[in-house]
């Protein structure tokens, strides 16, 4: 996602499972910290946004032709799991310790 | 990058190394096909944009709170190498068959 003036960074995003309709199968937690990647991928791309060569190239092309080519985008580059309690198909409450890819660990410019 | 109405997809982006100032060290090719990921990550996210769970969650939160949370972003999810000819520190033209991460192979919503 892009943000007005700030550089690409990880920001808080509390997600309530009821808001997204997942409370029908996720029993707990009721909400969790998903985080969100926000901010712009501005020239020059800093090391902390771990740019790929393509992102660097696109940033340079955007600099030259801003109306033709977009900036690189600030996105999750590493995700972390959360633990959830859910009802399995037999209706039995089951703990999944590692429900993968649910929370942002790192953001970067891609 | 985001695009107005179209869905996230790979589009052509011809990059001339002179335009980005890399012609000082990349001898050949003079330009290459970098591709660009363009288009929106709209609900529901299709399988072909290989969404992560976090991207699905963010899309659902955006649907509920569009002004608070951004959509997932259409970015390169797989990159390909190109071959380049460059001059080494001895002035000898040298071929790098696999200069990694220079061209988009696949786009997705992240």
């Amino acid at each position: 996602s892009t943000g007005a003036g700030s550089h690409c960074q990880k920001t808080s995003l509390r997600v309530n499972f009821e808001d997204i309709g997942w409370n029908s199968w996720i029993i707990a937690p009721k909400e969790y910290e998903a985080y969100e990647c926000k901010g712009g991928c501005f020239f020059p791309l800093a090391d902390d946004v771990t740019p790929t060569k393509h992102a660097i190239v696109q940033t340079l092309v955007h600099l030259k032709f801003p109306t033709k080519v977009g900036k690189a985008c600030c996105v999750p580059t590493k995700l972390s799991p959360i633990s959830i309690l859910y009802k399995d198909d037999m209706g039995v409450p089951t703990l999944k310790y590692h429900y993968e890819g649910m929370s942002v660990a790192e953001c970067g410019c891609r | 990058s985001t695009g107005a109405g179209s869905h996230c997809q790979k589009t052509s982006l011809r990059v001339n190394f002179e335009d980005i100032g890399w012609n000082s060290w990349i001898i050949a090719p003079k330009e290459y096909e970098a591709y660009e990921c363009k288009g929106g990550c709209f609900f529901p996210l299709a399988d072909d944009v290989t969404p992560t769970k976090h991207a699905i969650v963010q899309t659902l939160v955006h649907l509920k709170f569009p002004t608070k949370v951004g959509k997932a972003c259409c970015v390169p999810t797989k990159l390909s190498p190109i071959s380049i000819l460059y001059k080494d520190d001895m002035g000898v033209p040298t071929l790098k068959y696999h200069y990694e991460g220079m061209s988009v192979a696949e786009c997705g919503c992240r």
Partner: antibody, heavy 118, light 111 residues
Framework: QVQLVQSGAEVKKPGASVKVSCKAS????????MHWVRQAPGQGLEWMGE????????NYNEKFKSRVTMTVDKSISTAYMELSRLRSDDTAVYYC???????????WGQGTLVTVSS | EIVLTQSPATLSLSPGERATLSCRAS??????????MNWFQQKPGQAPRFLIY???NQGSGIPARFSGSGSGTDFTLTISSLQPEDTAVYFC?????????FGGGTKVEIK
């Protein structure tokens, strides 16, 4: 600066062998391919083959494959080209030259004249 | 093997004139967007000198009057304003495939 110094002129009889050396300096010897090119009197350039000093891998011109052997001695940064079963039409100046994996021959030795005569 | 044909065999021009040397390959020398074509200059009694590589790039210390162009199978070496010291034989060479091959050469003479 890069220097390739070749051994002196040789006179050989038909059927004999000749071994030309090329001593390299001014760069890391194992970094570039060493090529051998010959030039008969008043003629053009003829590529004989190349050797990668790093692991000793070779690519030979099919024309010379049965008669040529390219070797290196990394300890003294020297490349060798041995041509056997010499004929009168092997009379030529033999050059060593270095290039990268791209194959352009950037630096050349001064040449070694090999005369094959009975 | 790739055959390189150079023309003309001899070129006789006056100082200051423009020299255009041609090299035609029996198959394309392009790969990965790179042209595997090189040019060499050889003066009498000397080793060849690396002039142009990848069709259009000057070797180190090569005067600006030497330029190369072309792609695929047709390549040109241009000497924009001939100098007396440019009297030499010019060879094209392909480095795309083994065996690396040379053209037969073009002799440039100054009138």
């Amino acid at each position: 600066q890069v220097q390739l110094v070749q051994s002196g002129a040789e006179v050989k009889k038909p059927g004999a062998s000749v071994k030309v050396s090329c001593k390299a300096s001014g760069y890391t010897f194992t970094r570039y391919w060493m090529h051998w090119v010959r030039q008969a009197p008043g003629q053009g350039l003829e590529w004989m083959g190349e050797i990668n000093p790093s692991q000793g891998g070779t690519n030979y011109n099919e024309k010379f494959k049965s008669r040529v052997t390219m070797t290196v001695d990394k300890s003294i940064s020297t490349a060798y080209m041995e041509l056997s079963r010499l004929r009168s039409d092997d009379t030529a100046v033999y050059y060593c030259a270095i290039g990268s994996n791209y194959g352009g021959l950037v630096y050349w030795g001064q040449g070694t004249l090999v005369t094959v005569s009975s | 093997e790739i055959v390189l044909t150079q023309s003309p065999a001899t070129l006789s021009l006056s100082p200051g004139e423009r020299a255009t040397l041609s090299c035609r390959a029996s198959e394309s020398l392009d790969n990965y967007g790179i042209s595997f074509m090189n040019w060499f200059q050889q003066k009498p009694g000397q080793a060849p000198r690396f002039l142009i590589y990848a069709a259009s790039n000057q070797g180190s210390g090569i005067p600006a009057r030497f330029s190369g162009s072309g792609s695929g199978t047709d390549f040109t070496l241009t000497i924009s304003s001939l100098q007396p010291e440019d009297t030499a034989v010019y060879f094209c060479q392909q480095s795309k495939e083994v065996p690396r091959t040379f053209g037969g050469g073009t002799k440039v003479e100054i009138k």
